[in-house]
């Protein structure tokens, strides 16, 4: 909006706020079991991990902040099967970490986010 | 889990990860108009603002990470009414900023998050 109507400093603060809300990778807490699609018989300790996921606002309401590039981070977690038949096992779980984001008009066809090795 | 089975360093890394995923106030991007429940005739620039909101994991699946204390932050935004009858107005919008969080069994009764002055 025209700077003639408003104090330049105020406009600068508003613009900085907008920049910070833009679609970008943000640190997010994800629940491993639900992402893995595991049954309620299997759970993890800790149940959640921190990764970067795309989030934030787009210039158009119809656009969605989606990942354009992904790396996979290996997290060491305890996998526990109920009833307990053995000692909880320390397993590597690969979790999707979004490294690039873009405001896109439609969601990708295969939103897979976790790979177990 | 018993440290005898696993390397102390590995357990330390896992514990640090778990601490970081715990229910706490996290910087979040919120869409102002949808939070305000405004009609499509009224919109804001920027449409989103950054505030702290409760998020993260709880020790039990039945618990939800909820706010226990809230402060209200005033954000300067342009309020635009369509059809445009005047110059977009710079208005203070009070947005809920969660300052305390707790894992609770139920949602609070009044989840109001934005107040217009």
């Amino acid at each position: 909006f025209a700077a003639t109507f408003y104090d330049i400093e105020t406009l600068k603060v508003i613009d900085e706020e907008w920049q910070r809300t833009q679609c970008s990778p943000r640190e997010t807490c994800v629940e491993v079991a639900s992402e893995l699609g595991k049954s309620t018989n299997t759970f993890f300790k800790p149940p959640c991990v921190n990764v970067f996921r795309c989030g934030g606002c787009c210039n158009e309401e119809s656009l969605i902040c989606m990942n354009t590039s992904t790396s996979y981070i290996s997290k060491q977690l305890f996998e526990i099967s109920v009833p307990l038949t053995s000692v909880p096992e320390l397993v590597p779980v690969k979790v999707a970490n979004h490294t690039g984001c873009k405001c896109l008009p439609t969601a990708p066809r295969h939103p897979y986010s976790i790979i177990r090795r | 889990f018993a440290a005898t089975f696993y390397d102390i360093e590995t357990l330390k890394v896992i514990d640090e990860e778990w601490q970081r995923t715990q229910c706490s106030p996290r910087e979040t991007c919120v869409e102002v108009a949808s939070e305000l429940g405004k009609s499509t005739n009224t919109f804001f620039k920027p449409p989103c603002v950054n505030v702290f909101r409760c998020g993260g994991c709880c020790n039990e699946e039945s618990l939800i990470c909820m706010n226990t204390s809230t402060s209200y932050i005033s954000k300067q935004l342009f309020e635009i009414s369509v059809p445009l009858t005047s110059v977009p107005e710079l208005v203070p919008v009070k947005v809920a900023n969660h300052t305390g969080c707790k894992c609770l069994p139920t949602a609070p009764r009044h989840p109001y998050s934005i107040i217009r002055r």
Epitope: L11, D15, N59, E60, E61, S62 | T40
Partner: antibody
């Protein structure tokens, strides 16, 4: 008030390239996507694509993929649309249009006539 | 691509009388967020297009209240309650729910 001022008319030979500019004023340039639309003489409107001036992200109509490039210069609040390998059927008026948060193209440039003829 | 079909292609109207333009899309324009991104544009002779209605029924800045939009899903209508001389031109519907954004072929409004 919001204004989009486009560059002047161009005459090009087939196979050449054209770069049309669109200078924006009266609003925060990086806060709105810029669309490019063309209109052949006596015809309807055709969407070419858009650019997000905040980060330079582009989305193109597949019809023009490989031939069109949209860019912005945020220091001058100017959007550019370059079309390569011009053909006679690219003869059209090329418009830039700002898009509101709700998706409507709310402000338009006056258009740039590009004529492709040998 | 979403095909937008307008009817009629030409509409001769008497001044002061109502006019109606229909627009049908080949697929639903309801976005996954619940909104419908169907817009109407007016293009007067020798002028660039101008936004009249956005998101089905919201009149844009400076647009007279004789213009109104309605519809849902795949069927939409632009109505002019009383046609004035300045309303002469071509009217386009456009959608921004899907990519590529597409336009109707246009409806020419002329005075009888």
């Amino acid at each position: 008030q919001v204004q989009l001022v486009q560059s002047g008319a161009e005459v090009k030979q087939p196979g050449a390239s054209v770069k049309v500019s669109c200078k924006a004023s009266g609003y925060t340039f990086t806060g709105y996507n810029m669309y490019w639309v063309r209109q052949a003489p006596g015809q309807g409107l055709g969407w070419m694509g858009y650019i997000d001036p905040y980060n330079g992200d582009t989305t193109y109509n597949q019809k023009f993929k490989g031939r069109v490039t949209m860019t912005t210069d945020t220091s001058t609040s100017t959007a550019y649309m370059e079309l390569r390998s011009l053909r006679s059927d690219d003869t059209a008026v090329y418009y830039c249009a700002r898009t509101s948060y709700y998706g409507g193209m709310d402000y338009w440039g006056r258009g740039t006539l590009v004529t492709v003829a040998s | 691509d979403i095909v937008m079909t307008q009817t009629p292609l030409s509409s001769p109207v008497t001044l002061g009388q109502p006019a109606s333009i229909s627009c049908r899309s080949s697929q639903s324009l309801v976005h996954s967020n619940g909104n419908t991104y169907l817009h109407w544009l007016q293009q007067r002779p020798g002028q660039p297009p101008r936004l009249l209605i956005y998101k089905v029924s919201n009149r844009f800045s400076g647009v007279p209240d004789r213009f109104s939009g309605s519809g849902a899903g795949t069927d939409f209508t632009l109505k002019i309650s009383r046609v004035e001389a300045e309303d002469v031109g071509v009217y386009y519907c456009s959608q921004s729910t899907h990519v590529p954004r597409t336009f109707g072929q246009g409806t020419k409004l002329e005075i009888k």
